[in-house]
């Protein structure tokens, strides 16, 4: 009689994570008497996957009824496959012996590769806000995919970015892989409504890439521009001075009026006007009683935006019978009309 052969017909199989893997194995003879066992890997460190007679293998079921007389099919099904199950599986025939069973013959092995989807890409930006014209870095991470081949692209408002670096880890063989990419983005004043997108394409996604996004509104700080103007006289001895705070983001803003360097009033921005580009405008005014001042008055509008150092703009108010246009921003005098606020 011909010597028993262990036949594993499949050289390799590929299974999606979460599915079941069927590993085929048949023997050509019932002799010698002894059990079949399945292992992952070869050599002394091999891992026992299934022993038909003892042990606990809750994820493994046999394809055919091993108890049937003259059964020669020892195929198994492993449920709920994960990337950790990847490897080469051997169907091994043992011969009964004393004290232990003796390995008689092994199949050629079946390599199981596991297709695992990448996790949803997570995009994170810088910890601190940055202002327009500055370059900021965004990172994108995705984990747990297999095989290793993967494509990552960066976009800003639909336009593909080219300044980025990507690494896939580990470099060698692994059950699953991670991708890490860093893109550099130059901020502009119009970026409050902008989005940075990281797009990951992988064989498991069937042409439907995964995307992670970051809103530049969480990254950008647009500092305000200030304009101080003198409004027409309301009453004979009163002057209305306005401070226009324009095109700033985010909203957090505190304004302080100083008269000759002394704090007159502090207020926190509210009822803001939003511009189309997502920035905000705000206006504050100060009513100055000219008759209370013997000398010229230096009015300063001081703005602290988003916790940054204060910026200010001053206006010199002449206290005279016929005041002329004065000030560092050449605001109109009390008798002249000013431009309407935004």
């Amino acid at each position: 009689e011909e010597e028993l052969q262990v036949i594993q017909p499949d050289k390799s199989i590929s299974v999606a994570a979460g599915e079941s893997a069927t590993l085929h194995c048949t023997v050509t003879s019932l002799i010698p008497v002894g059990p079949i066992q399945w292992f992952r890997g070869a050599g002394p460190g091999r891992e026992l996957i299934y022993n038909q007679k003892e042990g606990h293998f809750p994820r493994v079921t046999t394809v055919s009824d091993l108890t049937k007389r003259n059964n020669m099919d020892f195929s198994i099904r492993i449920s709920n496959i994960t990337p950790a199950d990847a490897g080469t599986y051997y169907c091994v025939k043992f011969r009964k012996g004393s004290p232990d069973h003796v390995e008689f013959k092994s199949g050629a092995g079946t390599e199981l590769s596991v297709r695992a989807k990448p996790s949803a890409p997570v995009v994170s930006g810088p910890a601190a806000r940055a202002t327009p014209q500055h370059t900021v870095s965004f990172t994108c991470e995705s984990h747990g995919f297999s095989p290793r081949d993967i494509t990552l692209k960066w976009f800003k408002n639909g336009n593909e970015l080219s300044d980025f670096q990507t690494n896939v880890d580990p470099a060698g063989d692994s059950v699953s892989y991670s991708i890490h990419s860093t893109a550099k983005v130059v901020l502009t004043r119009e970026d409050v409504h902008s989005q940075v997108i990281c797009e990951v394409a992988h064989v498991t996604l069937q042409g439907d890439p995964l995307r992670g996004t970051a809103n530049l509104s969480e990254t950008i700080r647009v500092p305000p521009t200030l304009e101080v103007t003198q409004q027409p006289v309301r009453a004979e001895n009163q002057v209305n001075v306005t401070c226009q705070v324009r095109k700033f983001y985010p909203q957090r803003l505190q304004l302080t009026w100083l008269e000759n360097g002394n704090v007159s009033r502090t207020e926190t921005a509210s009822t803001l006007t939003e511009n189309k580009d997502g920035t905000y405008n705000w206006m504050s005014w100060l009513l100055v009683n000219v008759s209370a001042h013997r000398d010229d008055v230096k009015l300063t509008c001081q703005v602290e935006h988003d916790g940054q150092p204060a910026v200010s703009k001053s206006h010199d108010l002449k206290v005279s019978a016929h005041p002329k246009e004065q000030g560092s921003n050449t605001a109109p005098g009390p008798a002249l009309a000013s431009a309407a606020p935004l």
Partner: antibody, heavy 113, light 108 residues
Framework: EVQLQQSGAELVKPGASVKLSCTAS????????MHWVKQRTEQGLEWIGR????????KYAPKFQGKATITADTSSNTAYLQLSSLTSEDTAVYYC??????WGQGTLVTVSA | QIVLTQSPAIMSASPGEKVTLTCSAS???????LYWYQQKPGSSPKLWIY???NLASGVPARFSGSGSGTSYSLTISSMEAEDAASYFC?????????FGGGTKLEIK
């Protein structure tokens, strides 16, 4: 559902023999090795041996060679452990188990004059 | 034969405490063949961890197993009252199969 029902407690005299049974339900004992384990009061577990009910092949721990005999009857789906020449050292709970995963409730054997 | 030595023989732990039980083998045991059983007084042993690190059905996730070669351990990340029991390691890598002497784990 896998169940292993062991025979009741035994009080036996020194020098006598006793045969314990372990009847399986929910599976066929022919498909698994059936093991027997000894546990003395407040002590550890000792592997006695096992049987392959399919062909009657047995393995024993050296300590229990000659003391224990494991048999099986596939028609009644039952495994047996026979202990001979009993001494007080054999007073213990004896467990059967299926392939190391499922255990019977145990049988207390007390050897006393 | 492979001798399994468990330590400590007896230990007590407070609720919430991390507990590690060790099992040392006199010669190398393949991790696939190292099992742990839990036993409570008056009950049969229950398979608790199989193939070194896999939790049997119904075992809380606070339990974990690790090791290779001659050194294995069972860890409870945060002790609970219901974990008070005896724990036995077991090898079936080669005949005769053997058990460790057990660790009796008590709650403080």
């Amino acid at each position: 559902e896998v169940q292993l029902q062991q025979s009741g407690a035994e009080l036996v005299k020194p020098g006598a023999s006793v045969k314990l049974s372990c009847t399986a339900s929910g599976f066929n004992i022919k498909d698994y090795y059936m093991h027997w384990v000894k546990q003395r009061t407040e002590q550890g577990l000792e592997w006695i041996g096992r049987i392959d009910p399919e062909d009657g092949e047995t393995k024993y721990a050296p300590k229990f060679q000659g003391k224990a005999t494991i048999t099986a009857d596939t028609s009644s789906n039952t495994a047996y452990l026979q202990l001979s020449s009993l001494t007080s050292e054999d007073t213990a709970v004896y467990y059967c188990d299926r392939g190391l995963a499922y255990w019977g409730q145990g049988t207390l054997v007390t050897v006393s004059a | 034969q492979i001798v399994l030595t468990q330590s400590p023989a007896i230990m007590s732990a407070s609720p919430g405490e991390k507990v590690t039980l060790t099992c040392s083998a006199s010669s190398s045991v393949s991790s696939s063949y190292l099992y742990w059983y839990q036993q409570k007084p008056g009950s049969s042993p229950k398979l608790w961890i199989y193939s070194t690190s896999n939790l049997a059905s119904g075992v809380p996730a606070r339990f974990s197993g690790s090791g290779s070669g001659t050194s294995y351990s069972l860890t409870i990340s945060s002790m609970e009252a219901e974990d008070a029991a005896s724990y036995f390691c077991h090898q079936w890598s080669s005949y005769p199969y053997t058990f460790g002497g057990g660790t009796k784990l008590e709650i403080k």
